[in-house]
Interface confidence: low
């Protein structure tokens, strides 16, 4: 069946050195355990994290993300996943694309990560 992929509408903010979580889900929600799920970085499509055949595919990951990512799958049965990136770097700033692939059907959603220097960050308000 067909579905849409939904990511955060607004840029997600993180401080250098912190962890950040990028949520992504399909609508209508359904079990995505058997799907291929992943994040890559446009425009050059470097793989940030890939989940396929029921497990994380570390071998496909871009070197700069090895050991820094974790796919939170506790709600994958409802079609919801979250990518956690540890030790955020300035180079992580920019676009990420999340995708779900069910056999030959694939949909994607774009999201933006803003990375800020903790020494110059002022909380809004």
């Amino acid at each position: 069946g067909q579905f849409r992929v939904i990511g955060p509408r607004h840029p997600i903010r993180a401080l250098v050195g912190d962890e950040v979580e990028l949520p992504c889900r399909i609508s209508p929600g359904k079990n995505a355990t058997g799907m291929e799920v992943g994040w890559y970085r446009p425009p050059f499509s470097r793989v940030v994290h890939l989940y396929r055949n029921g497990k994380d595919q570390d071998g496909d990951q871009a070197p700069e993300y090895r050991g820094r990512t974790e796919l939170l799958k506790d709600a994958i049965g409802e079609g919801k996943v979250t990518l956690r990136i540890r030790n955020v770097r300035f180079s992580d700033e920019g676009g990420f694309t999340c995708f779900f692939r069910d056999h030959s059907y694939q949909e994607e959603a774009a999201m933006e990560l803003k990375v800020e220097d903790p020494f110059y960050w002022v909380s809004p308000g």
């Epitope: 992929v5 890559y40 446009p42 425009p43 050059f44 499509s45 470097r46 496909d60 871009a62 070197p63 920019g94 676009g95 694309t97 949909e107 994607e108 959603a109 774009a110 933006e112």
Partner: antibody, heavy 116, light 107 residues
Framework: EVQLLESGGGLVQPGGSLRLSCAAS????????MSWVRQAPGKGLEWVSS????????GYADSVKGRFTISRDNSKNTLYLQMNSLRAEDTAVYYC?????????WGQGTLVTVSS | DIQMTQSPSSLSASVGDRVTITCRAS??????LNWYQQKPGKAPKLLIY???ALQSGVPSRFSGSGSGTDFTLTISSLQPEDFATYYC?????????FGQGTKVEIK
């Protein structure tokens, strides 16, 4: 069905300007990075520029840096390439391409001829 | 920039032949290697991405292999519609770079 339709090509004198457009349909345009790739007559493919889905990232080939500007209007599902200070060596068919894992869909191309 | 070198630059083959095209990168690009087919007057078409993944709708006679610096595109049984020019492309690093192309002609 994914469709990419380029327009705006034509004959221009050296030093002149052109703006190429690429109208996209059949996919969620705002979810994808987009690129321009060119092909000089009888030659191979050369990447020109890319832009991220929100437009916050742009990249350019050294051969066009400072002369070309890539942009997009997600509300119009349209990709642009503003080309200034054109040179004879910019003569080529310009293709827009959708970025997935690779350039997974291409337009039919628009010919840019730079000649006096 | 990463240089991509294809060989041969052209080849002649017959329908039913097994055809192999190689692509070498000037430095390791992991599996960030894609293959495209282009026919005269037409836009390129993606065949293989990530070195070995077959793009949706592409016939299974096309296959890709390799990692690091050496890659191969194989057409297991050449069909009349396969006569075209084939390009490899790396998207490991900016700028994306293409091979110079391999023209597959009818023998």
């Amino acid at each position: 069905e994914v469709q990419l339709l380029e327009s705006g090509g034509g004959l221009v004198q050296p030093g002149g300007s052109l703006r190429l457009s690429c109208a996209a349909s059949g996919f969620t345009f705002s979810s994808y990075a987009m690129s321009w790739v060119r092909q000089a007559p009888g030659k191979g493919l050369e990447w020109v520029s890319s832009i991220s889905s929100y437009g916050s990232y742009t990249g350019y080939a050294d051969s066009v840096k400072g002369r070309f500007t890539i942009s997009r209007d997600n509300s119009k599902n349209t990709l642009y390439l503003q080309m200034n200070s054109l040179r004879a060596e910019d003569t080529a068919v310009y293709y827009c391409a959708k970025n997935g894992y690779a350039f997974d869909y291409w337009g039919q191309g628009t010919l840019v001829t730079v000649s006096s | 920039d990463i240089q991509m070198t294809q060989s041969p630059s052209s080849l002649s083959a017959s329908v039913g032949d097994r055809v192999t095209i190689t692509c070498r990168a000037s430095q390791s690009i992991s599996s960030y290697l894609n293959w495209y087919q282009q026919k005269p007057g037409k836009a390129p078409k993606l065949l293989i991405y990530g070195a070995s993944a077959l793009q949706s709708g592409v016939p299974s006679r096309f296959s890709g292999s390799g990692s690091g610096t050496d890659f191969t595109l194989t057409i297991s049984s050449l069909q009349p519609e396969d006569f075209a020019t084939y390009y490899c492309q790396q998207n490991d690093a900016s700028p994306n770079t293409f091979g110079q192309g391999t023209k597959v002609e009818i023998k």
